[in-house]
């Protein structure tokens, strides 16, 4: 029987800069029941506080609700593991909420095949930002990425959409059923999970064009750019 091994705070994430959660990995338990506590202080403060909520984030976590989350302060935190034989402390972790944002996936992904009379058909997709994110404050710039593939294909084709919430793709395989997903990330922070897949059946009479793909830079009424396959590699993130 031994004192517990050193725990490690391995991840802190915030969905929206208003709350955040940190998770730790226990060290070895030393063969005895072990209690964990997370303590923190904000840089410039002398008082230490203990985690306000060990429940919300699941096992080995600490959740900081709105009243405990400050965007403009760095949190200094550590985890203490204690059993009957002794204690051990994690390394201190410095957390700035601005840089740990991982939004929820975008919502309401809509995908349609558009077949205008005067132009080539294209796949049009539209989505909404995650609800928890308030883009009106200007605190957030969200960037989007789309991926799609035929249902039975192994490889995804990925497109960077910038700040747009609409996107067009021209080059698709006729008669195939496609899966489409979208994800987002703030300017500083982490990519969200991919949204649930939306399925779209491409009609058999869809005109294939291997040379070019059409990407909308503006909204649907705005200017459109033809981008060659070569240029498109700059937009790819596999």
């Amino acid at each position: 029987q031994l004192p517990p091994g050193k725990p490690e705070i391995f991840k802190c994430r915030s969905p929206n800069k208003e709350t955040f959660t940190c998770w730790w990995r226990p060290g070895t338990d030393g063969g005895l029941p072990t209690n964990y506590s997370l303590t923190y202080h904000r840089e410039g403060e002398t008082l230490m506080h203990e985690c306000p909520d060990y429940i919300t984030g699941g096992p080995n976590s600490c959740h900081f609700g709105k009243q405990y989350t400050s965007m403009w302060r760095t949190y200094v935190m550590m985890v203490n593991a204690t059993n009957q034989m002794g204690s051990s402390f994690s390394d201190e972790l410095y957390v700035d909420v601005t840089y740990i944002v991982q939004p929820d996936p975008p919502l309401e992904l809509t995908v349609e095949v558009k077949q205008p009379e005067d132009r080539k058909p294209y796949l049009w997709m539209k989505w909404s930002p995650p609800t928890l994110i308030d883009l009106k404050t200007g605190w957030f710039t969200l960037l989007y990425e789309i991926r799609l593939k035929p249902e039975k294909a192994a490889e995804w084709e990925t497109h960077f959409a910038g700040q747009q919430t609409e996107f067009k793709i021209l080059s698709l395989h006729p008669g195939q059923k496609y899966l489409v997903q979208v994800r987002c990330k703030p300017d500083h922070g982490y990519w969200s999970a991919w949204s649930p897949a939306t399925f779209i059946q491409i009609p058999s009479d869809f005109i294939m064009n291997d040379e070019q793909k059409l990407i909308s830079e503006e909204d649907l009424g705005g200017e459109q750019k033809l981008i060659s396959e070569e240029d498109l590699h700059h937009h790819h993130h596999h």
Epitope: L47, E50, C51, I55, Y68, N80
Partner: antibody, heavy 118, light 107 residues
């Protein structure tokens, strides 16, 4: 509605012991640090002790260090103060108070009177 | 330990008066100061925290200001229910300490 109710006060001789309790309701008790604050008759407020959410951080005023022990039972939504080696100067109304770490002592009980006298 | 000195200790005022209470800290405490109101036989009630943030449900005639070592509590227009004793408290470091109190009485 948040309620903190102290109990356990009374008359005790110098050198004696007493255990105060504070029962919390209407709050997620385990999410808050808790405190004991006392007020001698006609005097100001004196902070006595604080205990963090899982009891990993405990602090005492110098005047009670070594004599008083703060503890909590999150399963019972209860805070305790074990007071040993009581002195005349420990006579006071004892309040339990919730500490919102983002703010201050935002909820207080009604207090329980401890009289130390021979 | 950080000492808090409140001034004045007693204050006589009339309904409608503007009242200012000052709290000095013996060393810098940033903005970690709270103000409480206490009426006879009752528990203290939180008015202001982090020097200037009004606690929910507290009338807007109460305001707080200051940082470092000098802080003020202002009641813009004294109401009959405001006659009470007011305490400041520092939450910057242990031991947590309170000021000696300011009793606001009817003139």
């Amino acid at each position: 509605e948040v309620q903190l109710v102290e109990s356990g006060g009374g008359l005790v001789k110098p050198g004696g012991s007493l255990r105060l309790s504070c029962a919390a309701s209407g709050i997620t008790f385990s999410s808050y640090s808790m405190n004991w604050v006392r007020q001698a008759p006609g005097k100001g407020l004196e902070w006595v002790s604080s205990i963090s959410t899982r009891s990993s951080l405990i602090h005492y005023a110098d005047s009670v260090k070594g004599r008083f022990t703060i503890s909590r039972d999150n399963a019972k939504n209860s805070l305790y103060l074990q007071m040993n080696s009581l002195r005349d100067e420990d006579t006071a109304v004892y309040y339990c108070a919730r500490w919102d770490a983002a703010a201050a002592f935002d909820y207080w009980g009604q207090g329980t009177l401890v009289i130390v006298s021979s | 330990d950080i000492q808090l000195t409140q001034s004045p200790s007693f204050l006589s005022a009339s309904v409608g008066d503007r009242v200012t209470i000052t709290c000095w800290a013996s060393q810098g405490i940033s903005s970690y100061l709270a103000w409480y109101q206490q009426k006879p036989g009752k528990a203290p009630k939180l008015l202001i925290y982090v020097a200037s943030t009004l606690q929910s449900g507290v009338p807007s005639r109460f305001s707080g200001s200051g940082s470092g070592t000098e802080f003020t509590l202002t009641i813009s227009s004294l109401q009959p229910e405001d006659f009470a004793t007011y305490f400041c408290q520092q939450l910057n470091s242990y031991p947590l300490t309170f000021g000696g109190g300011t009793k606001v009485e009817i003139k």
